[in-house]
């Protein structure tokens, strides 16, 4: 699986889950997060070689396609595929407020 | 929504799906599809800009650090979100068989 | 350009033998079933023998009206298949055409070799 | 087996005329949408010639006066106007399953 695992402990060029660190403030400017003050969100990133995690049965024949035809602009693209939630902490007024938000970090990629 | 209605009609540069057009024979090397010959497979391309057709509350959050930190490398990326089936004929020795391949079509695209 | 050279038709004996070969050219050889058919004199077409590629371990088919007499083989190396036809019968008097089909239907023929069974 | 029946057996015809040729099948040659049924010309002393395949489709080379219809155990061949070379026997031949079959044939002769 392409996955933290995997991707943190290799050098692999193709398509693997990247640590990528946000800091809320600093990089996106919510300053009503109060914690954490930043988490690793990771992103995916890495060209998609025919049938590697391929996604769908689509993934695999443009692939092969690309693969045949490397002229072509149209190949799978590494995207999420496991994402994991995150809690915060962040105040309405003086009431402190915690929330779990959905889809927050990446654990794994895929070709799609 | 960005599916084949919207983007086969207008000059969309962002991500949009785009046709694309698969000769079973010529472009996969699949000499054993005999019907159809080719099919529109389609596909997904075009940047993805802050809020997009945001798959996810992670696509959502990179798409707002890329669009903060513009020489980043981890931004979302434009792929299948709708596929829709296709029905093939094959023969198997001298018995015909027909399949219905899943996720074949792309019908509309996402920012993930 | 898809070739397909049949030989070895001729007059026989009724109860002998014949072997009939049929050189192919311009296509997947190995790819594609291969079959043999049939024109009697003054009758329709008849499929008579099959053999398809070695993806389905080439299985064959013969009508019952040649069973158990005919034998279709093929020669991937050669891009040849032939037809040895033992016990030959006045009703099997006919040109004999070596056709291949990619699909369903037989896309391409040979020119035809006559196979005369007369004493 | 699936047995095909051609109709008619025979049938006179003038240069132009519009011919069609039927072939009724014992039981349904279609799959899905797919109809497994084709059709052949033989002329005397020459090899038989796809002109459609799968009751539809034009064979490569094939003129367009020539046409095909048809689903499940009914099917056409239309010459839409009858040309000198034309003159031929017309086979049909499905692959719904094993073993193949032909029709008995159709002789198109002059008038």
């Known amino acids: 699986a392409l996955d933290t695992n995997y991707c943190f402990r290799n050098l692999e060029e193709n398509c693997c889950v990247r640590p990528l660190y946000i800091d809320f403030r600093q990089d996106l400017g919510w300053k009503w997060v109060h914690e954490p003050k930043g988490y690793y969100a990771n992103f995916c990133s890495g060209p998609c070689p025919y049938l590697r995690s391929a996604d769908t049965t689509h993934s695999t024949v443009l692939g092969l396609y690309n693969t045949l035809n490397p002229e072509a602009s149209a190949s799978p693209c590494c995207v999420p595929q496991d994402l994991e939630p995150l809690t915060i902490l962040y105040y309405v007024g003086r009431t402190p407020k915690v929330e779990q938000l959905s889809n927050m970090v990446v654990k794994s990629c895929k070709c799609s | 929504a960005l599916d084949t209605n919207y983007c086969f009609r207008n000059l969309e540069e962002n991500c949009c799906v785009r046709p694309l057009y698969i000769d079973f024979r010529q472009d996969l090397g699949w000499k054993w599809v005999h019907e159809p010959k080719g099919y529109y497979a389609n596909f997904c391309s075009g940047p993805c800009p802050y809020l997009r057709s945001a798959d996810t509350t992670h696509s959502t959050v990179l798409g707002l650090y890329n669009t903060l930190n513009p020489e980043a490398s981890a931004s979302p990326c434009c792929v299948p979100q709708d596929l829709e089936p296709l029905t093939i004929l094959y023969y198997v020795g001298r018995t015909p068989k027909v399949e219905q391949l899943s996720n074949m079509v792309v019908k509309s695209c996402k920012c993930s | 350009e898809v070739q397909l050279l049949e030989s070895g038709g001729g007059l026989v004996q009724p109860g002998g033998s014949l072997r009939l070969s049929c050189a192919a050219s311009?296509?997947?050889?190995?790819?594609?079933?291969m079959s043999w058919v049939r024109q009697a004199p003054g009758k329709g077409l008849e499929l008579v023998a099959d053999?398809?590629?070695?993806?389905?371990?080439?299985?064959?088919y013969y009508s019952d009206s040649v069973k158990d007499r005919f034998t279709i083989s093929r020669d991937n190396s050669k891009s040849t298949v032939y037809l040895q036809m033992n016990s030959l019968r006045a009703e099997d008097t006919a040109v004999y055409y070596c056709?291949?089909?990619?699909?369903?239907?037989?896309?391409?023929w040979g020119q035809g070799t006559l196979v005369t069974v007369s004493s | 087996d699936i047995q095909l029946t051609q109709s008619p057996s025979s049938l006179s015809a003038s240069v132009g005329d519009r011919v069609t040729i039927t072939c009724r099948a014992s039981?349904?040659?279609?799959?899905?949408?797919?109809?497994?049924m084709h059709w052949y010309q033989h002329k005397p002393g020459k090899q038989p010639k796809l002109l459609i395949y799968?009751?539809?489709n034009l064979a490569s080379g094939i003129p367009s006066r020539f046409s095909g219809s048809g689903s499940g155990t009914d099917f056409t061949l239309t010459i839409s106007s009858l040309q000198p070379e034309d003159f031929a026997t017309y086979y049909c031949?499905?692959?719904?399953?094993?073993?193949?079959?032909f029709g008995g044939g159709t002789k198109v002769e002059i008038k």
């Open positions: 053999i398809v590629s070695k993806t389905y371990n080439y299985t064959t």
């Open positions: 039981q349904s040659v279609s799959i899905s949408r797919f109809n497994l």
């Open positions: 311009g296509f997947d050889f190995n790819s594609y079933g």
């Open positions: 031949q499905h692959s719904r399953e094993s073993p193949w079959t």
């Open positions: 799968r009751a539809s």
């Open positions: 056709t291949v089909a990619p699909g369903g239907s037989f896309d391409y």
